[in-house]
């Protein structure tokens, strides 16, 4: 039984990129406030976003404690005001979220090409190792720190004037590609976790072309 004038939350959805994780739900509150709880399958429930009028709750601080755990959240609806005035103090309404395993499900954020350096007919392209909100020993871990060899990058590159694209992959954050001397190339990168069944690929990085500021050229 729910308390008077409250409705259960619905459409509970996890929104997560590089472990920044927010639970969203509906409806916008009229006569109620929400409290969110999160737990692992074996753990205790922890309350977050207490008595909030928002319809989202940032759960990053909780999930980064162990990104390989599976989490469940639930959203409670409480009447917007003192319970006594609503005439009922029954169990509050709540709705469960889908299960969420950050390591397997967080979206890979858009990568950034940090730099590229041409030496003769070779170009070294470096993808930025993005910082996540996952901590170890009071320092924030990078995407590579968290995923290790599970994470690869794919580089798509082509002659500036051509439509034919080539690809290269790396288990690090660096590519070494062959180019023709005196020819400008463009490229973008994509983060990939091949072992995943969902959310395997990031969106494409912005395109960078040789001759732009990020590049260095040496004979």
């Amino acid at each position: 039984s729910g308390t008077t004038n409250t409705v259960a939350a619905y459409n509970l959805t996890w929104k997560s990129t590089n472990f920044k994780t927010i639970l969203e739900w509906e409806p916008k509150p009229v006569n109620q406030v929400y409290t969110v709880q999160i737990s692992t399958k074996s753990g205790d429930w922890k309350s977050k976003c207490f008595y909030t009028t928002d319809t989202e709750c940032d759960l990053t601080d909780e999930i980064v404690k162990d990104v390989k755990q599976t989490y469940l959240a639930r959203v409670f609806s409480y009447p917007a005001g003192n319970v006594e005035s609503t005439g009922s103090a029954g169990e509050p309404l709540y709705e469960n979220s889908p299960e969420f395993t950050p390591y397997l499900e967080t979206n890979l954020g858009q990568p950034t090409i940090q730099s590229f350096e041409q030496v003769g007919t070779k170009v070294n392209v470096t993808v930025e190792d993005e910082r996540t909100l996952v901590r170890r020993n009071n320092t924030f871990l990078s995407l590579r720190d968290v995923f290790g060899k599970d994470l690869i990058y794919t580089l798509y590159y082509w002659k500036d004037s051509s439509t034919g694209r080539k690809t290269n992959t790396t288990h690090t954050n660096e590519f070494l590609i062959d180019v023709e001397k005196g020819v400008s190339y463009c490229f973008f990168a994509q983060a990939v976790i091949p072992s995943r069944t969902v959310n395997r690929k990031s969106t494409d990085s912005p395109v960078e072309c040789m001759g732009q500021e990020k590049g260095e050229f040496r004979e």
Epitope: K28, P29, V30, V33, T35, Q37, W45, S47, F50, Y51, T52, T53, F76, Y78, G81, N82, V83, E84, S85, A89, E91, P92
Partner: antibody, heavy 119, light 113 residues
């Protein structure tokens, strides 16, 4: 009339534990959210913890998170605060307070119980 | 966290005169959906627990004398005692209940000049 009576305070050494109680009467205890608020000697008010009327949801100030646990027994009309790993900075008068017209507006307060953490 | 800042720290006012206490929040405590300011004022006399005076920034609690009034919106609020009485000597606190953690101002001590 509404009454809130705290007990369980005293002098305790750093690192030790203490459990405070707040006995409620004169109102339907199970229908109200309850809070602990503290006041260090000569200082201002600091919110410590809250528990919803049903006892399901609890929330804590960062300064006590992981060390203090708020709970309630609606059959006994009693609110509790279990305080572990006490520190000198936890020295304060601890008040229990009842949610009023809205969550976090305190219409009734107990008289408080003094907790002194000292070696 | 929302930080509440009160001014002045102390205030000496003659009996029958007006006392004004200010409270500023680090972010708005106005909830646009119901146009209410989630701010309360409390009075605390020596050796006693606090007593609720005002909630929703301007609504007097039952039994509170009408010489006490609250005003303001968003981030700036005022508690006014229109004609100070001897029994009003106390410390006054503002508190936001807009979001957790709940936070109080540092208090303003009101004395008789």
């Amino acid at each position: 009339q509404v009454q809130l009576v705290e007990s369980g305070g005293g002098v305790v050494q750093p690192g030790r534990s203490l459990r405070l109680s707040c006995a409620a009467s004169g109102f339907t205890f199970r229908s109200y959210g309850m809070h602990w608020v503290r006041q260090a000697p000569g200082k201002g008010l600091e919110w410590v913890a809250v528990i919803t009327y049903d006892g399901i949801n609890k929330y804590y100030a960062d300064s006590v998170e992981g060390r203090f646990t708020i709970s309630r027994d609606n059959s006994k009309n009693t609110l509790y605060l279990q305080m572990n790993s006490l520190r000198a900075e936890d020295t304060a008068v601890y008040y229990c307070a009842r949610d009023g017209v809205y969550y976090g507006v305190y219409d009734y307060w107990g008289q408080g119980t003094l907790v002194t953490v000292s070696s | 966290d929302i930080v509440m800042t009160q001014s002045p720290d102390s205030l000496a006012v003659s009996l029958g005169e007006r006392a004004t206490i200010n409270c500023k929040s680090s972010q708005s405590v106005l909830f646009s959906s119901n146009n209410k300011n989630y701010l309360a004022w409390y009075q605390q006399k020596p050796g006693q627990p606090p007593k609720l005076l005002i909630y929703w920034a301007s609504t007097r609690e039952s039994g509170v004398p009408d010489r006490f009034s609250g005003s303001g919106s968003g981030t700036d609020f005022t508690l006014t005692i229109s004609s100070l009485q001897a029994e009003d000597v106390a410390v006054y606190y503002c508190q936001q209940f807009h979001s957790y953690p709940l936070t109080f101002g540092g208090g303003t001590k009101v004395e008789i000049k």
